[in-house]
Interface confidence: low
């Protein structure tokens, strides 16, 4: 048996993945647990095995289909249950009526590349991954640039309030190594959150020409 408070949080990547984290204060000794997804109006259901990510939390990914397939829509409800084995039976530990498009977290942007770099400027582009066509242009981005001697947490956030998959960084220092990250968020969804940050893109500004500032 399990005592203590539990928290069950899931996000939909807008296409074919629901990622869940279940936290439980009470100890779970050698207990097998899983998340079961039961859509309200669809033939399929799906299960994933919860794996420990810390002493009191477990995570798993419900893979609903091919990465770019649109498995759920804005009017779907998925009943999500945490089931843990107790002897020969499964016990329901947590349950929620999950509204996918109210609980969105997209995949991190991919394919970051330097389009053009100068001494003080750098133009960077990226792509969004596995994002639903339902959003049309209703997405926003946050970007940050890591300067030498600073941490990511200290980097100021640049906000792009529209679906703009590029940025022109200005007022950079010549001949300097930088790193850049971006994340994305749909405008839709009461509990929607930012995607993870993209993999950092490293770039170096061009050196200043001798005797002149480009």
């Amino acid at each position: 048996a399990v005592n203590g408070t539990s928290q069950f949080t899931c996000f939909y990547n807008s296409r074919a993945n629901i990622s869940c984290v279940w936290s439980q204060d009470g100890a779970l000794q050698d207990t097998s647990c899983q998340v079961h997804a039961w859509p309200d109006r669809r033939r399929w259901n799906q299960t994933c095995e919860l794996l420990p990510v810390s002493q009191a939390s477990w995570a798993c990914n419900l893979i609903l289909g091919a990465p770019d397939s649109q498995k759920l829509t804005t009017v779907d409800i998925v009943t999500l249950r945490v089931l843990c084995r107790e002897g020969v039976r499964w016990r329901v530990m947590a349950i929620q009526d999950f509204k996918p498009f109210e609980n969105l977290r997209l995949m991190a942007p991919i394919s970051l590349q330097v389009v053009h770099v100068e001494t003080h400027r750098c133009n960077i582009s990226w792509e969004i991954s596995q994002a639903s066509h339902y959003f049309e242009r209703h997405l926003e981005f946050e970007a940050r640039t890591l300067s030498p001697g600073h941490t990511w947490e200290e980097a100021p956030l640049l906000t792009l309030k529209q679906k703009q998959e590029w940025i022109c960084l200005e007022t950079l220092t010549p001949d300097t190594q930088y790193e850049f990250q971006v994340r994305v968020k749909p405008l839709q969804g009461e509990f929607t959150t930012w995607s993870p940050w993209s993999q950092p893109l490293a770039f170096r500004t061009k050196p200043a020409a001798l005797g002149k500032d480009t």
Partner: antibody
Framework: EVQLLESGGGLVQPGGSLRLSCAAS????????VHWVRQAPGKGLEWLGV???????DYNAAFISRLTISKDNSKNTVYFQMNSLRAEDTAVYYC?????????????WGQGTLVTVSS | DIQMTQSPSSLSASVGDRVTITCQAS?????LYWYQQRPGKAPRLLIY???NLASGVPSRFSGSGSGTSYTFTISSLQPEDIATYYC?????????FGQGTKVEIK
């Protein structure tokens, strides 16, 4: 065989409230959502709200302040309560369930129960 | 709310005629349904997801369309098809129905 059976209709005073029941058989209300739809005399169909298999609800915003949908899983029954009734709430009230496949629509309907709001 | 507008609101046709009803949505919808309602009866699902025939529905009924414009067809009208037909969208809440098309036999 999937069946839905509404009850609780009849004459209600203006300003009063109504409580309808929808008894389900052939499936469990813990596995399927149940919707409510009404039809005023000689008029079209109007979706009112739904209770999902896990117990949460969605309502038509036009009725959210005076509508409550609930259920008793042990009785496999869904309840519909509407307050502050007026003459224009006179209608046949249906409970309905979607089918099993992708977006099957309302494949199963109750026979409907007539509610008349009049003094 | 998405408004669903059916036309015509009523029609009269002869047995064996091809009958077409259109449903126009005020914005693009992904999933459209057609129902038949005979007098004094509950609605009956005929077409789901735009063009799929519901279980037990005769093949003379069909549906097509996309975006904001949808069509329902009875290829050869039969006496038992006398009813009111409704379209319904299931793309966003609240779910909404068309105002209905009453089909009569000449």
């Amino acid at each position: 065989e999937v069946q839905l059976l509404e009850s609780g209709g009849g004459l209600v005073q203006p300003g009063g409230s109504l409580r309808l029941s929808c008894a389900a058989s052939g499936f469990t209300v813990t596995s399927y959502a149940v919707h409510w739809v009404r039809q005023a005399p000689g008029k079209g169909l109007e979706w009112l709200g739904v209770i999902w298999s896990g117990g949460s609800t969605d309502y038509n915003a036009a009725f959210i302040s005076r509508l409550t949908i609930s259920k008793d899983n042990s009785k496999n029954t869904v309840y519909f309560q509407m307050n502050s009734l007026r003459a224009e709430d006179t209608a046949v009230y249906y409970c309905a369930r979607a089918g099993d496949a992708n977006y099957d629509g309302f494949a199963y309907w109750g026979q409907g129960t007539l509610v008349t709001v009049s003094s | 709310d998405i408004q669903m507008t059916q036309s015509p609101s009523s029609l009269s046709a002869s047995v064996g005629d091809r009958v077409t009803i259109t449903c126009q949505a005020s914005q693009s919808v992904s999933f459209l349904y057609w129902y038949q309602q005979r007098p004094g009866k509950a609605p009956r699902l005929l077409i789901y997801d735009t063009s799929n025939l519901a279980s037990g529905v005769p093949s003379r009924f069909s549906g097509s369309g996309s975006g904001t414009s949808y069509t329902f067809t009875i290829s050869s009208l039969q006496p038992e098809d006398i009813a009111t037909y409704y379209c319904q969208q299931w793309s966003t809440y609240p779910l909404t129905f068309g105002q209905g098309t009453k089909v009569e036999i000449k």
